[in-house]
Interface confidence: low
């Protein structure tokens, strides 16, 4: 039975040209995390694999940085980066857990970050 839950940064906003950290946290399970995928709609952004480490998709290499932890840092944000992001935890033996984050990239300087996880 899948007992785990995923906590995410929820709905967040950031300024155009800036950076944002996407973070998810899997709790309430003893399952082993074998891999975490970060995806935007149907595009794969990055993977953190327990054996092979981080892999950033070639088309995002210049704007995506691994970490902190199992999170993902998006840099040089554009308005086109607005949308849904998913963290997909592949675990053994539980199976797959998915978390959702909605990012809004704003033109102005009034962007507020979500309360759960903040960029220092």
């Amino acid at each position: 039975m899948m007992t785990g839950t995923i906590e995410t940064t929820g709905n967040i906003s950031a300024e155009k040209g800036g950076s944002i950290i996407l973070q998810c946290h899997l709790s309430s399970t003893t399952a082993q995390v074998t891999q975490v995928n970060w995806e935007q709609q149907d595009q794969l952004l990055a993977i953190c694999n327990a054996d092979l480490g981080w892999h950033i998709s070639p088309s995002f290499k210049d704007r995506v940085a691994p970490g902190p932890g199992l999170g993902l840092t998006l840099q040089s944000l554009t308005v086109n980066d607005t949308g849904e992001y998913f963290c997909i935890y592949h675990t053994y033996p539980d199976g797959t857990y998915t978390g959702r984050i909605f990012l809004e990239v704003l033109e102005s300087s009034v962007a507020e970050h979500g309360a759960r996880f903040q960029i220092p």
Epitope: T34, Q35, N37, E39, D42, Q43, L44, I47, N49, A50, D51, L52, H55, S57, P58, H90, Y92, P93, G95
Partner: antibody
């Protein structure tokens, strides 16, 4: 509909080369690792090779290492298997298959219908 | 010689329960979840069980998997004639960096 279609099989003489192709459709090909698996006549399944979603990580079965090369062209949604120095024991139906994950080799969740390679003089 | 060991054959009557075993080693089954594939003669294999005990959509709940230590098993309850096929277990080997496949078990449905 998620689909894999293999082509390129045929009758070939020992020592020659052959390239198999696998055309993918119905899913985001560039997000998945891909495998080649073969099955000799009347025998079980034998894993041949795997390639990661972006093509930078590849692993091979000992029986084909140094002779076969797995590659992919994500812009064409196509997987390849270049087979050199073919031997009679390479005679088999060759299947391409999708891995549910991009890097962590879990297994194969979608299979093609297979293409037959016969190595004989 | 396969790195994963399966019985060559198994059989049962319609409605019966049949279990197929698969044994491996600490470098594969001791570290990774096993998958099971079904192959009906003349057709491509089909994923039956993944991540030890998960069923893809469309696979009847008559099929179940379990795994403990370096061995795994596939159980088919309420056997049906269409279950007559060959069954393969498979697991990624972390040490050799290869996908190991069992030799296959031919299941015959009697009667």
């Amino acid at each position: 509909e998620v689909q894999l279609v293999e082509t390129g099989g045929g009758l070939i003489q020992p020592g020659r080369s052959l390239r198999l192709s696998c055309a993918a459709s119905g899913f985001t090909f560039s997000s998945y690792a891909m495998h080649w698996v073969r099955q000799a006549p009347g025998k079980g399944l034998e894993w041949v090779a795997v390639i990661s979603y972006a093509g930078e990580v590849k692993y091979y079965a000992d029986s084909v290492k140094g002779r076969f090369t797995i590659s992919r062209d994500n812009s064409k949604n196509t997987l390849y298997l270049q087979m050199n120095s073919l031997r009679a024991e390479d005679t088999a139906v060759y299947y391409c298959a999708r891995d549910p994950l991009p890097l962590h080799y879990y297994g194969m969740d979608v299979w093609g219908q297979g293409t037959t390679v016969t190595v004989s003089s | 010689q396969s790195a994963l060991t399966q019985p060559r054959s198994a059989s049962g009557n319609p409605g019966q329960r049949v279990t197929i075993s698969c044994s491996g080693s600490s470098s594969n089954m001791g570290r990774r979840p096993v998958n099971w594939y079904q192959q009906i003669p003349g057709t491509a294999p089909k994923l039956l069980i993944y991540s030890q005990n998960q069923r893809p959509s469309g696979v009847p709940d008559r099929f179940s998997g379990s795994q403990s230590g370096t061995s795994a098993s596939l159980t088919i309850s309420g056997l049906q004639s269409e279950d007559e096929a060959e069954y393969f277990c498979a697991v990624w080997d972390d040490i050799g960096r290869v996908l190991q496949l069992g030799g296959g078990t031919q299941l015959a449905v009697l009667g």
